[in-house]
Interface confidence: low
C-alpha cells in the first residue's frame, strides 16, 4: 500500500504541481490533525496559504477564544484558518504573512511582513512581525510589539475597556490599536464612521471597514 | 480651557448618602473617561471607579462595589459619584479626573490605558456623627 | 490585585537629582504614570505612559521602568518641588486603576 501524502502548507502542495487555486486537506507533520485550507496557486509565484478572508460578511466572526483556536467559516469563502494550526506551522520554519485589501472604491494595497509566526495558546497566540513592505502604509497597522490575541470571551488586549466586545471579532488588539480586520462586516455605503469595522488605520483611516481582506503565508525564501 | 468643576465640600451623618458632581467644560465630555478617586486626611490616593460618558458604562474598584453609583448626564456635560452607606473612614477628599477613551478617539485607535491629565479641585466630605 | 510600594519619604539638597522608585511585579512591562501633589491642592500629572512628559511640565522630570521598578527622577530640584508623589499602573488582570502608596519629597534647606 502506497504511503500517503501530506502537506503541511499551500506551498508544498504547489511544490507537488498542484497548481490550481483551491481547497486543500493540509496536515502538519507528525500529526494525524487535518485542516482544510484555500490555497492561492497564482498571487505572487503560488503556493499561498488563506490563513483569513472576509468578502461579503456570510460568516459572523464574532466567536470564542476555542472557535479561533481551532479555525471557523468556509475556506472557500470567508473563513479563519485556525490560530493553533497558524501558531505550530510558523514555528516549524521562518514564514512571511501577507495581507491584501480592498476597498469600496476599486482600490487594492498589501502590506507584507518578511517575518511572522505566532506564539502558542499559553502565550496567548500572541503575534510577532518583522520586516513591513507594501502599499498599505508606511506604519504596520497590527501594533508593534505584537500583542495577545484576544476573543470576546478571554480579554487580552491593553485596553480599560474589552477591545473584542467594543469593536466585535478575535484580533490582537493593542488598546485597541490600528486594525481589526475581524470586525463587523458593513456594506457599502454604511461603511464610514464605524469604530468597530474592518479596520487598515494607516492604509484607510480610522472609521473606514473595507470591502475585502485576505491574511495568507508562505514559507520565506 | 479645560477643567473640571467639583460641587462644595460636604458633611454628613454615618448611614447617609453622598452624591458628589463634576462639571466638565472644554472638550468633548464623551471623548474622555471619567474617574473619581479619594484622599483620606494624610493618606494617599485611592481609585474609585470610572464613567464612559459616551456610553454609561461603569467600572467599580472592588472596594466600593455595591456602595458607590456613577452616572453622568451627557446634556450638562456633568459626571455624578454617589457613595451610600457612609462611615467615618469614608471622609475624604473626592476628586474626578478625566482620561482620553482608548476607543472613542480611534485615529489610530492605539492609546495604552491612558493617564489622568485633568482633575478636579476635589470636594471634602466628612462622616461624622 | 496588584500592589505598587514607595518609599515613604525621599530628601535631596536643591540642585542635586532626586529618585523616586515604585516597585511592583513585573511592572517594567507595564505603562507608568507619575502623579505630583502639592499640599491642598489636586494632583498634577508629571510623567505618562513610564517616560513622556505633559506639556507645562519641565524636561527636569523623567521617568524610567524595567524589571520589578519604575523611577521618576527630578535633576536639579528646586525648593517648588518639594510635595508628594504618587505612581499609578492600569491592572488588567483586575480592569483595575493601582496607585502607589506615596513619597514625600523633601527639599533640604
Known amino acids: 500500500k502506497g504511503e500517503q501524502i501530506s502537506f503541511r502548507d499551500c506551498a508544498e502542495v504547489f511544490k507537488s504541481g498542484h497548481t490550481t487555486n483551491g481547497v486543500y486537506t493540509l496536515t502538519l507533520p507528525n500529526s494525524t490533525e487535518e485542516v482544510k485550507a484555500y490555497c492561492d496557486m497564482e498571487a505572487g509565484g503560488g503556493g499561498w496559504t488563506i490563513i483569513q478572508r472576509r468578502e461579503d460578511g456570510s460568516v459572523d466572526f464574532q466567536r470564542t477564544w476555542k472557535e479561533y483556536k481551532v479555525g471557523f467559516g468556509n475556506p472557500s469563502g470567508e473563513y479563519w484558518l485556525g490560530n493553533e494550526f497558524v501558531s505550530q506551522l510558523t514555528n516549524q520554519q521562518r514564514y512571511v504573512l501577507k495581507i491584501h485589501l480592498k476597498d469600496w472604491e476599486g482600490n487594492e494595497a498589501y502590506s507584507l511582513y518578511e517575518h511572522f509566526y505566532l506564539s502558542s495558546e499559553e502565550l496567548n497566540y500572541r503575534i510577532h512581525l518583522k520586516g513591513l513592505t507594501g502599499t498599505a502604509g508606511k506604519i504596520s497597522s497590527i501594533s508593534q510589539p505584537g500583542n495577545d490575541f484576544s476573543t470576546k470571551d478571554a480579554d487580552n488586549d491593553k485596553c480599560i475597556c474589552k477591545c473584542s466586545q467594543m469593536l466585535t471579532g478575535g484580533w490582537w488588539f493593542d488598546a485597541c490599536g490600528p486594525s481589526n480586520l475581524n470586525g463587523m462586516y458593513y456594506p457599502q455605503r454604511q461603511n464610514t464612521n464605524k469604530f468597530n469595522g474592518i479596520k487598515w488605520y494607516y492604509w484607510k483611516g480610522s472609521g473606514y471597514s473595507l470591502k475585502g481582506t485576505t491574511m495568507m503565508i508562505r514559507p520565506a525564501g | 480651557q479645560v477643567q473640571l468643576v467639583q460641587s462644595g465640600a460636604e458633611v454628613k451623618k454615618p448611614g447617609a448618602s453622598v452624591k458628589v458632581s463634576c462639571k466638565a467644560s472644554g472638550y468633548n465630555f464623551a471623548g474622555y473617561y471619567m474617574h473619581w478617586v479619594r484622599q483620606a486626611p494624610g493618606q494617599g490616593l485611592e481609585w474609585m471607579g470610572w464613567?464612559?460618558?459616551?456610553?454609561?458604562?461603569?467600572n467599580y474598584a472592588q472596594k466600593f462595589q455595591g456602595r458607590v453609583t456613577m452616572t453622568r448626564d451627557t446634556s450638562i456635560s456633568t459626571a455624578y459619584m454617589e457613595l451610600s452607606r457612609l462611615r467615618s473612614d469614608d471622609t475624604a477628599v473626592y476628586y474626578c479626573?478625566?482620561?482620553?477613551?482608548?476607543?472613542?478617539?480611534?485615529?489610530?485607535?492605539?492609546?495604552?490605558?491612558?493617564?489622568?491629565?485633568?482633575w478636579g479641585q476635589g470636594t471634602m466630605v466628612t462622616v461624622s456623627s | 490585585s496588584y500592589v505598587l510600594t514607595q518609599p515613604p519619604s525621599v530628601s535631596v539638597a536643591p540642585g542635586q537629582t532626586a529618585r523616586i522608585t515604585c516597585g511592583g511585579n513585573?511592572?517594567?512591562?507595564?505603562?507608568v504614570h507619575w502623579y505630583q501633589q502639592k499640599p491642598g491642592q489636586a494632583p498634577v500629572l508629571v510623567v505618562y505612559?513610564?517616560?513622556d512628559r505633559p506639556s507645562g511640565i519641565p524636561e527636569r522630570f523623567s521617568g524610567s521602568n524595567s524589571g520589578n521598578t519604575a523611577t521618576l527622577t527630578i535633576s536639579r530640584v528646586e525648593a517648588g518641588d518639594e510635595a508628594d508623589y504618587y505612581c499609578q499602573v492600569w491592572d488588567s488582570s483586575s480592569d483595575h486603576w493601582v496607585f502607589g502608596g506615596g513619597t514625600k519629597l523633601t527639599v533640604l534647606s
Open positions: 513585573n511592572i517594567g512591562s507595564k505603562s
Open positions: 464613567i464612559n460618558p459616551n456610553s454609561g458604562g461603569t
Open positions: 505612559d513610564t517616560s
Open positions: 479626573a478625566r482620561s482620553p477613551n482608548p476607543y472613542y478617539y480611534s485615529s489610530p485607535g492605539y492609546y495604552y490605558p491612558a493617564a489622568f491629565d485633568i
